[in-house]
């Protein structure tokens, strides 16, 4: 009599990962009497994946009846299918017995899995970094099957090339993850500035997954101080403006010191935008002169997003003949950022 | 689900010439498609491809001489100087719903010949 | 762009036999290989892809493997339906290109 053939006539089946595959088997013969079982993988490790006779297999259903006389199609079905049902299955027969004696095995059907990366999730330095430094930032995805994928970053469109790009494991896997990290200079023109984070999967339809990250929250901008007299008014009062310009975030707060005494302290709120996303803001401080014997030494101290203060300092002359005094006059930068206006 | 490819005619060299791809049982914003060519008695030769979303990627010899584009229900595929070597059967396809590294709906084809 | 180089060019095979079609990618496509059947004034129609996964409906008597640069398509038992003309395309998944073999003419005696 012709020797019995289990038949798996797919070498490989690929599917999508959420729906069901279909495993074929047929035998060319009812004798002898035994089961089909359906294993993954070979050798003592192996993993029953469908029995009739017995155990429960919620996800697994048999393509025919296989209660039904002369059956010889053993086929199944797997429902939502993961990447952890890659693998390869065989179908195996089985002569009935005392125990049951494993007589042929199928040649396996390979299943592989495919499944789309997750949408890249970027993230920035924890603390933010001033112009020219640079700042590191590292892009994610998922769960995606099979391995082969590309990662690339832009910065306002342009591609970035210092980058560091690992894919996980290295070996065999039902499903792998992605991690890049990629390394940014900083300019003063950043504040509007984006990187994305590209992936492009052979499951995509679309275009690449996109992640993006503003560097809006990675940079600080620090401010630039300048302090100006206006003309001295007829009433002795002299008035000092102190112009803090080009920083960001606005998170500010400006101090005034007379003499090294606190005379006022302001926050920055609700400042209107420049076009590069920096901020300006002046602030005016009267001083009465003829309050004064001596001169005056004023402070314009500037704490920028909890960072060490920035003060510029000059004095005012104090004269016998007080509107006398030079009008409209800058305060020069020196090194000890004090300022002599007569 | 099928496509078919519409618009092939005799053309002169440098006149546009605008090829249609029209699908029915599935939807354009779902899939990949493609557009391919076979010149007379030789093999299949790959254009380009629109994304689902509408981006056109294109082979590297095109270099300008085709464009792709689609409405809901079409693909587009101009040709916009057309050369008597574009003379040929133009397809279009459908990639799998696997992956886009293999197409499994194909049109039958439409012709076009470019003459003086 | 990545070139295939598909050999033979033409084969011819008695029913029942079995031929052998190779196709050679100019580096690694990763298994992201299909292979295509065309008849004369006919659409091509796909029989295998991701290099050797089976397109529904399509006969187990036609066979893909390979992997990196190699490739394979294997007809056994022939028919005399299966004259036809076989193309392999390739996908790079870092060019995101296509390709296509220059085509294996196959004649059934």
């Known amino acids: 009599e012709e020797e019995l053939q289990v038949i798996q006539p797919e070498k490989s089946v690929s599917v999508a990962a959420g729906d069901s595959a279909t495993l074929n088997c047929t035998v060319s013969s009812l004798i002898p009497v035994g089961p089909i079982q359906w294993f993954r993988g070979a050798g003592p490790g192996r993993e029953l994946i469908y029995n009739l006779k017995e155990g429960h297999f919620p996800r697994v259903t048999p393509v025919s009846d296989p209660t039904k006389r002369n059956n010889m199609d053993f086929s199944i079905r797997i429902s939502n299918i993961t990447p952890a049902d890659a693998g390869t299955y065989y179908c195996v027969k089985f002569r009935k017995g005392s125990p049951d004696v494993e007589l042929k095995s199928g040649a396996g059907t390979e299943l592989s899995v495919r499944a789309k990366p997750s949408a890249p999730v970027v993230s920035g330095p924890a603390v933010r970094a001033t112009a020219e430094h640079t700042v590191s930032f590292t892009c994610e995805s998922h769960g995606f099957s099979p391995r082969d994928i590309t990662l690339k970053w832009f910065k306002n469109g342009n591609e970035l090339s210092d980058v560091q790009t690992n894919v996980d494991p290295a070996g065999k896997s039902v499903s792998y993850s992605i991690r890049s990290t990629a390394r940014v200079v900083l300019t003063r023109r950043d504040v509007h500035s984006q990187v994305i984070c590209e992936v492009a999967h052979v499951t995509l339809q679309g275009d690449p997954l996109r992640g993006t990250a503003n560097l809006s929250e990675a940079i600080r901008v620090p401010p630039f101080l300048e302090v100006t007299q206006q003309s001295m008014r007829a009433d002795n009062q002299v008035n000092v403006t102190c112009q803090v310009t080009k920083f960001y975030p606005q998170r500010l707060q400006l101090t005034w010191l007379e003499n090294g005494n606190v005379s006022r302290t302001e926050m920055a709120s609700a400042l209107p935008e420049n076009k590069d996303g920096t901020y300006n803001w002046t602030s005016w401080l009267l001083v009465n002169v003829s309050a004064h014997r001596d001169d005056v030494k004023l402070t314009c101290q500037v704490e920028h997003d909890g960072q060490p203060a920035v003060n510029k300092s000059f004095s005012v002359k104090v004269s016998a003949h007080p509107k006398e005094q030079g009008s409209n006059t800058a305060a020069e930068n020196t090194g000890t950022n004090e300022r002599n206006i007569y | 689900q099928s496509v078919e490819e519409s618009g092939g005619r005799l053309g002169t060299p440098g006149t546009p010439l605008t090829l249609t791809c029209t699908v029915s049982g599935f939807s354009l914003s779902s899939y990949v498609m493609g557009w391919f060519r076979q010149a007379p008695g030789k093999g299949l030769e790959y254009i380009g491809i629109?994304?689902?979303?509408?981006s056109p990627y294109y082979a590297s010899w095109v270099n300008g001489r085709f464009t792709i584009s689609k409405t809901s229900t079409t693909m587009d595929l101009k040709m916009n100087s057309p050369t008597t070597e574009d003379t040929a059967t133009y397809f279009c396809?459908?990639?799998?719903?696997?992956?886009?590294?293999?197409?499994?709906?194909w049109g039958p084809g439409t012709l076009v010949t470019v003459s003086l | 762009d990545i070139v295939m180089t598909q050999t033979p060019s033409s084969v011819e095979a008695a029913v029942g036999g079995t031929v052998t079609i190779k196709c050679q990618a100019g580096?690694?496509?990763?298994?992201?290989l299909a292979w295509y059947q065309q008849k004369p004034g006919q659409r091509p129609k796909l029989l295998i892809y991701y290099a050797s996964t089976l397109e529904s409906g399509v006969p187990s008597r036609f066979k893909g493997s390979g992997s990196g640069t190699d490739y394979t398509l294997t007809i056994s038992d022939l028919e005399s339906a299966d004259a036809a003309t076989y193309y392999c395309?390739?996908?790079?998944?870092?060019?995101?290109?296509?390709?296509f073999g220059g085509g294996t003419e196959v004649v059934v005696k």
């Open positions: 396809a459908r990639v799998g719903p696997l992956g886009v590294d293999y197409f499994n709906i």
């Open positions: 395309q390739s996908w790079h998944y870092i060019s995101r290109s296509y390709a």
């Open positions: 629109i994304s689902s979303s509408g």
């Open positions: 580096q690694s496509i990763n298994s992201y």
